[in-house]
Interface confidence: low
């Protein structure tokens, strides 16, 4: 009963538990003397039904049996599963304008009985955890219901823990709070779940196991790795275990890995040799432990040791590129390039580079260690160079790699023939060429360089460069390449001692240019007229620039103009024209052309020749 | 049987700091689960922070996460709670909890100490 009930009381037929389905009876009765003062025959009994606090029904229609003035009985069906709330309350009828007074309440709960628990799983989490036993209870009953675990064993050992399900909290999980020791690995031992509720009972079958069944060690602990003589490739993993583990499992990974190194171990003692790790690398590393070799179940993961393994000296070879440069008549400058090594051959932080120039003949030598990846030097343009480079870190230096120092585009006999460039998408271009005609040395290697055209490339930018072996023709440069803007692309071939090049221009992507080139004078020299511009600035080309066209046309005329093409070179801003007729006023005007169209007009200029006509 | 003795608690001006600490007898320590839960004055119990048996995992209810740490100390058998920046709404009898595994339900419990922020 929900309220202190002074008015009178509320009972349920045949319970105020009822199954699924089921109709109950409600009787409402007031105590003696309570009811509407003046007209006891005016007692009006009515039954309010609530669903979550909320009234739902008025049961006045429902109403079986009534005794005038003194009590009421209600049938109530198709009641919902949970719990539903029935209020009954007093009219007196007289009173219109007083609301019904509440004389008791009464709760109903709909639910079913437990089903038989199933899938009965028990584990014990380390030598010294407690068993602790989990099922599956089946459908929700709706109602509170109590769950017994019992547990029996050898030398009549007996053990229950209870705990209950209802709308707040799930019971489908006990720790029973004992401990299975490791001398009772041979014993059996039977779990069985009872579940009771108001509407019934159930029982689980009995579910038997052993110690090695049941038992999950606790995940190894205290893990670390010692590695030998500082090796960056072996150490010894070491942690600490439960006495009874008798095979770990170990995983490792470098961190950036998607896949593990599995290893399993038996009898280990909490030690393990690895031999295969790479250097100068971030591992994890993760063990996992069983008590028994063909039974029982493996332990959680460790928590991760996270370590990086020592250096090792580098290995592989740098790839190394230069530039020539004659600054005097005896004096060369010499750029060194080079790239950096992998992390798998760099095996270690690189300290530095040393970089050696040696002239053959004379045995000069240049010596010098620098961190960058790149270094120059002026030196005599006589004598044949030779220049090595070498990787160091803290455990030692990688093996000198060697480039003889060659005239790069000296050797017409060793010009690469028909190089083209096409451009594959926004970011690539592919590089073709046909190799030399009549060489008479044997190419030993292509060198594909390309930098964009830009002011100030050659000394702000270090070259791209790609090695391609003799027996290829083709190159897909990609490095650094980025749309809309000129690359020009080298074609180096070298022999022993010498060098041919080729030269061509490649973008990945082309448009218009956004404006034409300005026109800053026009001059008349012996019956020429010479048109000087400035070239487009870098952004606005938008690609590599095909040709510039010079257009004109006498003044207010409304004729299509004359124009002439000419093939777009770096250095070239001006060119002469020969075909205007004398004292006519024209108007001239430029604009350049990409292979995606040709740009809007540059500036207007207007010039009147005074000379004879050709 | 295990008993867990809680110390610490007191009366602290809001923004301040204390720290609780937590002792269990009667089991290995480094084999039990533990956890700090607290109950306001007319309100449930309900949990604060809780720490596995190694340390390595740790879970913080949303209302103290960057104001509360959890830690452990198995060569001091103690279970501890930092709590900072303490709020009014904080004040309420602190209990410490033990369980045999991560797993488990809580099965043992302290008999709290009081923790008091005053505006």
């Known amino acids: 009963n929900i309220d202190v009930c002074k008015l009178g009381t509320v009972t349920v037929q045949p319970a105020p538990v009822i199954p699924l389905g089921s109709a109950a009876n409600i009787s409402c009765s007031l105590n003696p003397k309570q009811g509407c003062s003046h007209y006891p025959s005016s007692n009006e009994l009515i039954l309010l039904k609530f669903v979550n606090d909320v009234l739902v029904e008025n049961l006045h229609g429902k109403k079986v049996h009534d005794h005038t003035g003194h009590s009421s009985t209600f049938q109530v069906t198709n009641l919902s599963l949970g719990m539903t709330l029935f209020v009954c309350k007093l009219n007196c009828s007289n009173s219109q304008k007083k609301p019904p007074v509440p004389v008791c309440g009464v709760e109903i709960s709909v639910g079913v009985a437990p089903e038989p628990p199933q899938n009965i799983s028990c584990v014990q989490e380390g030598e010294n955890g407690t068993v602790a036993c989990s099922w599956n209870s089946g459908k929700v009953t709706y109602l509170k219901t109590n769950y017994t675990l019992q547990l029996s064993g050898p030398n009549n050992l007996t053990c229950q823990k209870q705990c209950f399900s209802d709308n707040r909290q799930n019971c489908n999980r006990l720790d029973l709070g004992i401990n299975l020791s490791p001398d009772l690995a041979e014993s059996r031992f039977i779990v069985r779940v009872t579940a009771i509720n108001d509407l019934g009972n159930s029982s689980s079958l009995p579910h038997t196991f052993t110690f090695l069944d049941i038992v999950i060690p606790l995940p190894p602990w205290d893990i670390r790795i010692n590695f030998l003589n500082a090796s960056g490739s072996r150490g010894t993993l070491q942690w600490e275990d439960e006495g009874q583990v008798v095979l770990n499992q170990l995983r490792y990974q470098p961190l950036n890995s998607t896949s593990w190194n599995m290893v399993n171990a038996t009898n280990a003692k909490g030690k393990y040799d690895l031999r295969d790790l790479r250097p100068f690398t971030e591992y994890e590393f993760q063990i996992s432990s069983k008590l028994h070799l063909s039974g029982g179940s493996w332990s959680n993961w460790s928590e991760s040791l996270r370590t990086r393994t020592p250096e090792e000296e580098p290995v592989g070879i740098l790839d190394i590129w230069y530039m020539k440069q004659d600054i005097d008549y005896d004096r060369q400058q010499i750029s060194l390039f080079w790239k950096s090594l992998n992390p798998s051959e760099a095996r270690g932080k690189i300290l530095h580079y040393q970089v050696t120039l040696q002239e053959v003949t004379k045995k000069t030598t240049l010596q010098n260690t620098t961190r960058h990846t790149s270094w120059t030097r002026v030196i005599p343009r006589t004598g044949a160079w030779t220049a090595s480079v070498s990787a160091a870190n803290s455990k030692g230096a990688s093996a000198p790699t060697h480039i003889n120092i060659v005239d790069l585009c000296g050797t017409g006999l060793l010009a690469p023939h028909q190089v083209s460039a096409k451009s594959e998408n926004m970011d690539n271009i592919l590089v073709t060429w046909q190799p030399p005609k009549k060489a008479d040395s044997a190419v030993r290697e292509y060198i594909v360089e390309w930098r964009a055209l830009q002011p100030g490339s050659i000394t702000k930018f270090p070259p791209h460069w790609l090695r391609i072996p003799p027996d290829n023709m083709s190159a897909l440069i990609s490095e650094n390449i980025k749309p809309y803007i000129c690359y020009e692309i080298r074609v180096h071939a070298l022999s022993e001692s010498q060098g041919g090049c080729s030269s061509i221009r490649g973008d990945s992507k082309h448009k218009a240019p956004v404006s034409g080139p300005h026109i800053t004078a026009i001059t008349e020299k012996k019956e020429r007229l010479f048109i000087s511009w400035t070239h487009i600035p870098f952004p606005e080309q938008r690609g590599c620039i095909l040709h510039y066209r010079i257009y004109w046309k006498e003044r207010d005329s409304t004729a299509q103009p004359e124009l002439c093409e000419i093939q777009y070179r770096r250095s070239q801003n001006s060119h002469p024209i020969s075909s205007l007729q004398p004292r006519v006023t024209y108007v001239l005007w430029m604009t350049a052309v990409t292979a995606a169209g040709e740009s809007p007009q540059g500036n207007e200029r207007e010039f009147c020749p005074q000379g004879k006509a050709n | 049987q295990v008993q867990l003795q809680e110390s610490g608690g007191g009366l602290v001006q809001a923004g301040g700091s204390l720290r609780l600490s937590c002792t269990p007898s009667g089991r290995t320590f480094s084999t039990l689960a533990m956890g700090w839960f607290r109950q306001a004055p007319g309100k449930e119990r309900e949990v604060v922070a809780t720490?596995?048996?190694?340390?390595?995992?740790?879970y913080y209810a949303s209302s103290v996460k960057s104001r509360f740490t959890i830690s452990r100390d198995n060569a001091k058998n103690t279970a501890y709670l930092q709590m900072n920046s303490l709020r009014p709404d904080d004040t309420a009898v602190y209990y410490c909890?033990?369980?045999?595994?991560?797993?488990?339900?809580?099965?043992?419990w302290g008999q709290g100490t009081q923790v008091t922020v005053s505006s």
């Open positions: 720490i596995s048996w190694s340390g390595g995992r740790t």
């Open positions: 909890a033990a369980r045999g595994t991560d797993y488990g339900a809580y099965d043992y």
